[in-house]
Amino acid sequence: MMCLECASAAAGGAEEEEADAERRRRRRGAQPGAGGSACCGARGVGGAGVVSADEEVQTLSGSVRRVPSGLPSIPSTPGCAAAAKGPSAPQPKPASLGRGRGAAAAILSLGNVLNYLDRYTVAGVLLDIQQHFGVKDRGAGLLQSVFICSFMVAAPIFGYLGDRFNRKVILSCGIFFWSAVTFSSSFIPQQYFWLLVLSRGLVGIGEASYSTIAPTIIGDLFTKNTRTLMLSVFYFAIPLGSGLGYITGSSVKQAAGDWHWALRVSPVLGMITGTLILILVPATKRGHADQLGGQLKARTSWLRDMKALIRNRSYVFSSLATSAVSFATGALGMWIPLYLHRAQVVQKTAETCNSPPCGAKDSLIFGAITCFTGFLGVVTGAGATRWCRLRTQRADPLVCAVGMLGSAIFICLIFVAAKTSIVGAYICIFVGETLLFSNWAITADILMYVVIPTRRATAVALQSFTSHLLGDAGSPYLIGFISDLIRQSTKDSPLWEFLSLGYALMLCPFVVVLGGMFFLATALFFLSDRAKAEQQVNQLVMPPASVKV
């Protein structure tokens, strides 16, 4: 597996990556062009200067490379038969490797689609699950809470493991695990609701392994704009998977005449994807794309990683901003369909709902909008960032900040428009969500820039934990609580049902504005933190010649 500089040209040529690589080589005092296109530790197939697989020594904290005997003690930078031939020898850039990395990113993205497809298939048949098991609303809330809590708790654990052990094995095991659990859960008898709760908790653990580790592999396969693009594809999987989950849930239920079959689709696809990950995703070294040769030193302790992340201001502020996004999406996703239904009751275009599901049509429209705006947001965000990077080095956090602040305006306008026009409200939702979702991939990219490769899985995990804890774990309940509080002090009428929920939801744009402020704060520290991370990577790299085995 060759690093980005070798393969990106084959995949369409990335001049800026080459220039960036050249700059870094000069910083390390390497001769320009030495070793041809200085690539990262590839597993060779024998041959001069290429390290074969058996020359790699696995340790608990990573792997070190034995220098093949009979070779000069040069940094084992693959590509490296070329180094033996001399600097003038042009290095061929095999297209297959570019395709291989593209395929790896595609499979990882497919895995993410399945992650969310599985999660939202359950949402798609939740009413059937509630009906079958006799689950009350508090029970449905328990299912969601158990999932989020187990996900939150498991994420830092997998972050720790992901920075220290074989990531693709952890990924595949995670997929196999949640697939098996979801499949088994389709056979749970009616009297064992607690087993269903347990299964959702276990699925949360399985999915946490994927969500925390997969982005770091993409981060190690690509850099700069290519990485932004690939992360965009990876994060587009969220709305795509969510939308497909709803569709799969309802359509499989209708086709089979039994909701149980809906829970048997994603596990089968999951098993296939897990196998493909094992076969096709390369066992990339941490910092593969960033470091250009050499070998990263042994991993630091988890406590030291946490201290470093907490001191990393760009990381902290972007994580808080992500929490704000999570808060808003969690609350809006839960309450907007009901809010719009109540708006129609007030406008006398719909009847008061006494028997749930209330606002089913609005849920469907909102789901479709979320799915499409997720795609549009990711594309818009990535495109805007690429364009802005030509003008400022702080493009990433600034694009996020603008997106958040713009989103807050349109979220506010939802509540203005809903009083008179449902179509107007939907337009505001469309624009607001597009802007809100525009920072998904960019936030991940910011993390890749400011966190060193050996800490990335822990960083993703901690960010995931924080965004759930401060975001969607509590926001739906908080909005409901505020709405009930307002209603207690007003007269019981459809108008006040509508207004109280609207006033409660007004908390969302304020939180989004706060998130925008956090992104602006990220912009202040972004360049210094990025430089620090690059400097740390350079310090972490040591030539394998000096490694005592």
Epitope: K136, Q190, S355
Partner: antibody, heavy 125, light 107 residues
């Protein structure tokens, strides 16, 4: 001790209305799902209607044979469940039982763990 | 709707004998079956829930088994108070349905 007491039965003409009431005691009514089950003379049991608790938005479910004619409702403050029967037919003649579903806080069983003594409704011209 | 068939409609036994009452569902319903006893001029009472789970206060001679479509209610050494009608009920899906009943009578 759990108690379910039905009242409101009697003899009515086809097409007329009747409201059955079930007074409950000995358990937390507001958290419990309640149903009406009927039994025509010399025949088997037939489920009529179910009303869930407020934590399930007091959702109601009905048997196809009575849908649109009967309405189940509850009053948590009085611990009572009702069955409003409109457009009554001859085939609605039966003993109507008020039943309780076993409750497990987060979920409820669909089976009936307690039954009232029943109330007779006769529809005849 | 899920249809339940009980057999035999009537079962004549002598006290002290052991019997098995059958209930068959029109489709697979896992273990979502429940058994009730209705003595003459009385309200029904729950005997067994979820195919095999016993109920507090119900004599241990009553037991249930089965899964999928075929279910059995067994009465070990029938006593005089057991002569009544037995109904099975499914809760796998709405509408909730009952079997037509099996009448246990003295031989």
């Amino acid at each position: 001790e759990v108690q379910l007491v039905e009242t409101g039965g009697g003899l009515v003409r086809p097409g007329s209305s009747l409201k059955l009431s079930c007074a409950t005691s000995g358990f937390t009514f507001s958290d419990t799902w309640m149903s009406w089950v009927r039994q025509a003379p010399g025949k088997g049991l037939e489920w009529v209607a179910l009303i869930k608790d407020k934590n399930s938005n007091s959702e109601a479910n009905y048997a196809e044979s009575i849908k649109g004619r009967f309405t189940i409702s509850r009053d948590d403050s009085k611990s009572r469940v009702y069955l409003q029967m409109n457009t009554l037919r001859d085939q609605d003649t039966a003993t109507y039982y008020c039943t309780r579903h076993e409750d497990f806080y987060y979920y409820s069983g669909y089976y009936f763990d307690y039954w009232g003594q029943g109330v007779m409704v006769t529809v005849s011209s | 709707d899920i249809v339940l068939t009980q057999s035999p409609p009537t079962l004549s036994v002598t006290p002290g004998e052991s019997v098995s009452l059958s209930c068959r569902a029109s489709q697979g319903i896992s273990t979502s079956i429940h058994w009730y006893q209705q003595r003459s001029n009385e309200s029904p009472r729950l005997l067994i829930k979820y195919a095999s789970q016993s109920i507090a206060g119900i004599p241990s001679r009553f037991s249930g088994s089965g899964s999928g479509t075929d279910f059995i209610l067994s009465i070990n050494r029938v006593e005089s108070e057991d002569f009544s009608v037995y109904y099975c009920q499914q809760t796998y899906s709405l509408p909730l349905t009952f079997g037509p009943g099996t009448k246990l009578e003295v031989k």
